[in-house]
Amino acid sequence: NQDLPVIKCVLINHKNNDSSVGKSSSYPMVSESPEDLGCALRPQSSGTVYEAAAVEVDVSASITLQVLVDAPGNISCLWVFKHSSLNCQPHFDLQNRGVVSMVILKMTETQAGEYLLFIQSEATNYTILFTVSIRNTLLYTLRRPYFRKMENQDALVCISESVPEPIVEWVLCDSQGESCKEESPAVVKKEEKVLHELFGTDIRCCARNELGRECTRLFTIDLNQTPQTTLPQLFLKVGEPLWIRCKAVHVNHGFGLTWELENKALEEGNYFEMSTYSTNRTMIRILFAFVSSVARNDTGYYTCSSSKHPSQSALVTIVEKGFINATNSSEDYEIDQYEEFCFSVRFKAYPQIRCTWTFSRKSFPCEQKGLDNGYSISKFCNHKHQPGEYIFHAENDDAQFTKMFTLNIRRKPQVLAEASASQASCFSDGYPLPSWTWKKCSDKSPNCTEEITEGVWNRKANRKVFGQWVSSSTLNMSEAIKGFLVKCCAYNSLGTSCETILLNSPGPFPFIQDNIS
């Protein structure tokens, strides 16, 4: 055992920065720090076989399997995967350890399996075994958290039935509005399932696992706040738990709170009250209305009344299935090159949506903001004034929604020209779509003013590059113009742009494309 080399096996996970990852040493990847794989001599094996802990990675992940060998002298090596030999080039690190790496780019099923590394050193021969499999993420789920009352205690339990088991945290804030944004100093996070301090202004519970993060806000009516102009609305699906908190502050304890559904007092067992004195000796009362599993008949106006405050209501709507309500008609926008502009979609949805903005096959993160009227809005401003088609896609457990936007950027045409033996073509991407003219340059018309109308064929939009329209014009070659310079011009309301082409002559002149503008 003392004569054997010290072997360290590591896994390096790469975050792909680019879809065109190659196997060269300069592939555009950001690497996480190496992770030890606990390489150990395999018990009762013939020969010296080291084994690394089994590795499970996501499909399309890019990883490096690496072995560091602390043994004197040179080493030679060979990788074997599914009976195929793979090249192996050891190098030495700063600590003079031999380093052997196997890069697996964009992991697929065919790349899963056993990777054997055979190493020959001056002292001994040994084998290192890596087993790489693809993680089955099909079983993964992340469900929105919901609340339950803790048995025999005035506390709420936050539950998220997710796989892998999520980390649950309460996100608490005692300020109003904007200052309750996630990373604000007013926000306090508690990584626990049970919450006893239920008097705060804003209470949310979030669950996170490998799939992301989902949050649920404790719906609250604050009798000390001016009511919203539109009645607050709460949607729930049949079978989900209902929780509404009514909160009121008064100079002394001489007030009470009650809940009514459609003017009928809630049954006992469907509410509980808590009270506390605040720092300035005012009394805070909260009264929870809850139904452990809602049915259609739990729909209606829930009103919280106080003997010392004006009452306030919320409309609870119980639905069989989730929904996304928004207008899906496509929208076209035309803006100047430096004009500030954002796409926006206003929608009403339950459960909360997951969404993306897509442009030219690239997805962008999607942020949503709740409005006071029960609607939400998602804006996208990061278009960098690139014309084309933008797609907003939203989905929740029960519904999907897609909306298309076209962005046109007003600009003067820019012309590209190409010619063949039989025709000359010009292309332009200006907007509004340009009109075309062709002119012949000759002794009679050195300024190229002689217009060509014969043999011209205009196509308004002959190809779409990620939704961007390109206009083209083609001039068919005739004997009358062979050997001459011709000029194609594209013009729109913002200006004109031209390109000059020397048409292929039958004489000794070779074909040239001349870009004189």
């Epitope: 606990g38 690394a52 590795v55 075994l129 087993t131 892998p164």
Partner: antibody, heavy 124, light 107 residues
């Protein structure tokens, strides 16, 4: 270099809940099939295994303490958390966390690397 | 649960002695057994895994043998740094269980 470090309160009162955190570096529970266990050792006594969490989030607990123990992990923070409810003076011990790699050919080398341990005293 | 009975619970020996510590499992655990050495105020250190595989960096005077229910740890020639407490651990099935320990003292 692989390290594990236990942290938490050094003193807890009877009936309180103990929360211990094992923060590790040099390996992860994200890609490699690894597990982390909690083990304790009362002063002058033998080692006692408490709980284990696997990289796929499966858990296993000591039979005698199962009702009081909860183990969880936060892969992104490289942490494993143990909670032990309703603490009693007999729970006074040094608490260790240790890692256990799993090998695809069906064997395990048990705990190859341990944390230094954290002493917890239960007293009113 | 699988019970691990370790013997002796304490042992006095001299430098150069050959020492054997035994662990008995209450049921078949194949070779899923590890041996650990612990010194006062320190964390345990793995010596042997899979009943007989020597941990990298551990002196070859330590050896392990056995399979099924009977296991032994042998130190062929005791060195001053070997005086410590030794534990066996079965990891064949959960819950995992340690032996009661063997305290090896200088005679």
């Amino acid at each position: 270099q692989v390290t594990l470090k236990e942290s938490g309160p050094t003193l807890v009162k009877p009936t309180e809940t103990l929360t211990l955190t094992c923060t590790f570096s040099g390996f992860s529970l994200r890609y490699a099939r690894m597990g982390v266990s909690w083990i304790r050792q009362p002063p002058g006594k033998a080692l006692e295994w408490l709980a284990h969490i696997f990289s796929n989030d499966e858990k296993s607990y000591s039979t005698s303490l199962k009702s009081r123990l909860t183990i969880s992990k936060d892969t992104s923070k490289s942490q494993v958390v143990l909670t032990l409810t309703n603490m009693d003076p007999v729970d006074t011990a040094t608490y260790f966390c240790a890692r256990m790699p799993e090998y695809s050919s069906g064997w395990s080398g048990a705990f190859d690397i341990w944390g230094q341990g954290t002493m917890v005293t239960v007293s009113s | 649960d699988i019970q691990m009975t370790q013997s002796p619970s304490s042992l006095s020996a001299s430098v150069g002695d050959r020492v054997t510590i035994t662990c008995r499992a209450s049921q078949d655990i194949r070779n899923d057994l590890a041996w650990y050495q612990q010194k006062p105020g320190k964390a345990p250190k793995r010596l042997i895994y899979a009943a007989s595989s020597l941990q990298s960096g551990v002196p070859s005077r330590f050896s392990g043998s056995g399979s099924g229910t009977e296991f032994t740890l042998t130190i062929s020639s005791l060195q001053p740094e070997d005086f410590a407490t030794y534990y066996c651990l079965q990891h064949n099935s959960y819950p995992l269980t340690f032996g009661g320990g063997t305290k090896l003292e200088i005679k």
